[in-house]
């Protein structure tokens, strides 16, 4: 099943997020991803946990998953590089870099997103954009077109309250509010974009979605700048 969803979102403007990727397993959407360089897509490590025997591909330039679009193209994956410290049973270091079989053909609907290199927390209250093709309601309806939601960043102290994530949010993670509107499993690997810059990647740990006491958890890309650079080099 797809890992992740956007709850309470709206349909995104078509091709207005040219960095958006759909990580696919055997031709079906599995996770979100974000184009960070011509030949590299960043996603979440847990996305490939159950993909050992399947064919992993990356769809770029898409708004609709099913309809033909001139900008859409499916790329094979040459190499999958999960973060060396990622583990199945934790949300820490939940990053994955996918090297495409060739450089992506760039254009208005396909373009890498600048990612944050300055290792400083995003100010609480900042509105950030999350997009994905995950299911849109608790009944499990899957959208065909890209959805997005605006979420305010939540300070780490609040997110770490006993009633919330009880100390699990390290300095390498960040949270966003989850009151009715939320990212969740199926949007895992997708981008959290603040001020036009990639700040976070949706983690793929299992948690209840759309519950304000369980804020969304995102991996802070700035905290992994050295690792990303070393893989892309």
């Amino acid at each position: 099943p797809p890992r992740g969803r956007i709850l309470g979102g709206r349909e995104a403007e078509a091709h207005a997020r040219p960095y958006m990727a759909s990580v696919q397993l055997n031709g079906a959407h599995l996770c979100g991803g974000v184009l960070v360089a011509e030949q590299w897509v960043l996603s979440a490590a847990h996305c490939l946990e159950d993909a050992a025997d399947g064919k992993v591909q990356v769809l770029l330039g898409a708004h609709s998953l099913s309809q033909p679009e001139p900008s859409k193209r499916l790329y094979d994956v040459l190499r999958a590089v999960p973060h060396p410290d990622s583990q199945p049973d934790t949300i820490d270091h939940d990053l994955l870099l996918l090297q495409l079989s060739e450089k992506a053909t760039l254009g208005p609907a396909v373009r890498p997103l600048p990612w944050q290199r300055v290792d400083r927390d995003v100010a609480p209250g900042t509105l950030c954009d999350v997009a994905g093709w995950g299911i849109v309601n608790h009944a499990g309806r899957r959208p065909d077109s890209l959805q997005h939601v605006l979420l305010p960043v939540l300070d780490r102290a609040t997110c770490n309250r006993r009633t919330h994530h009880d100390g699990a949010i390290t300095e390498r993670l960040m949270c966003a509010e989850s009151n009715r509107r939320d990212s969740c499993k199926g949007d895992s690997g997708g981008p959290l974009v603040c001020g036009g810059v990639l700040e976070g990647v949706v983690t793929s740990g299992s948690r209840v979605c759309g519950n304000r006491k369980k804020p969304g958890i995102y991996t802070r890309v700035a905290s992994y700048a050295a690792w990303i650079d070393s893989v892309l080099a």
């Epitope: 709206r10 100010a123 609480p124 209250g125 900042t126 509105l127 939601v149 605006l150 305010p152 939540l154 300070d155 609040t158 309250r161 509010e177 009151n179 009715r180 509107r181 001020g195 036009g196 304000r212």
Partner: antibody, heavy 120, light 107 residues
Framework: EVKLVESEGGLVQPGSSMKLSCTAS????????MAWVRQVPEKGLEWVGN????????YYLDSLKSRFIISRDSAKNILYLQMSSLKSEDTATYFC?????????????WGQGTSVTVSS | DIQMTQSPASLSASVGETVTITCRAS??????LAWYQQKQGKSPQLIVY???TLAEGVPSRFSGSGSGTQFSLKINSLQPEDFGSYYC?????????FGGGTKLEIK
């Protein structure tokens, strides 16, 4: 029908405190960010602060952070603004406002406003 | 903090005319811009948010445009009820700041 009704303001001495309230009706209060905005007579609008859905996070104009506290009571559908160490420059009409459902810091419904005068 | 600069500060126009008010942000606010109308002694009313989305009940003679740092509000065929003050505001993040306002008066 969405309604926001502020409590009576009034005249207070410099250095004193005052608590404003705003009673909300016609919508699910706990589903919305709420804000306070003020307006000096014949002048522009100034955002005072916001509170999130359940009151766990508040955001303030930097210059007011140490003196103003925003809170909410979701059981009673009431938003509060506690002002302390009041100064003459806090004299203004204070509005409570509801954050738009999706674009939280746009304000789609406003109260009628309540006048606060700080003077000796 | 992001500064919002509105122009003109005041404007005289006749019923039936078309007017445009502009707003400039000191940094890129993408599409996160709102416009409010305020009549004397009343509370502000949201007219437009996210640059061009009309708020509920707002007539179609109002339209918003722009992106990044430059925005405008256009009112076609001015009606008597359109006169008053207009404020732009970014709703991009904390603190959401307002422009200084434009007073639209009847000529």
């Amino acid at each position: 029908e969405v309604k926001l009704v502020e409590s009576e303001g009034g005249l207070v001495q410099p250095g004193s405190s005052m608590k404003l309230s705003c009673t909300a009706s016609g919508f699910t209060f706990s589903d919305y960010y709420m804000a306070w905005v003020r307006q000096v007579p014949e002048k522009g609008l100034e955002w005072v602060g916001n509170i999130n859905y359940d009151g766990s996070s508040t955001y303030y104009l930097d210059s007011l952070k140490s003196r103003f506290i925003i809170s909410r009571d979701s059981a009673k559908n009431i938003l509060y603004l506690q002002m302390s160490s009041l100064k003459s420059e806090d004299t203004a009409t204070y509005f409570c406002a509801r954050g738009e459902d999706f674009y939280l810091y746009a304000m789609d419904y406003w109260g009628q406003g309540t006048s606060v005068t700080v003077s000796s | 903090d992001i500064q919002m600069t509105q122009s003109p500060a005041s404007l005289s126009a006749s019923v039936g005319e078309t007017v445009t008010i502009t707003c400039r942000a000191s940094e890129n606010i993408h599409s996160y811009l709102a416009w409010y109308q305020q009549k004397q002694g009343k509370s502000p009313q949201l007219i437009v948010y996210n640059t061009k989305t009309l708020a509920e009940g707002v007539p179609s003679r109002f339209s918003g445009s722009g992106s990044g740092t430059q925005f405008s509000l256009k009112i076609n065929s001015l009606q008597p009820e359109d006169f008053g003050s207009y404020y732009c505001q970014h709703h991009y993040g904390i603190p959401p700041t307002f422009g200084g306002g434009t007073k639209l008066e009847i000529k």
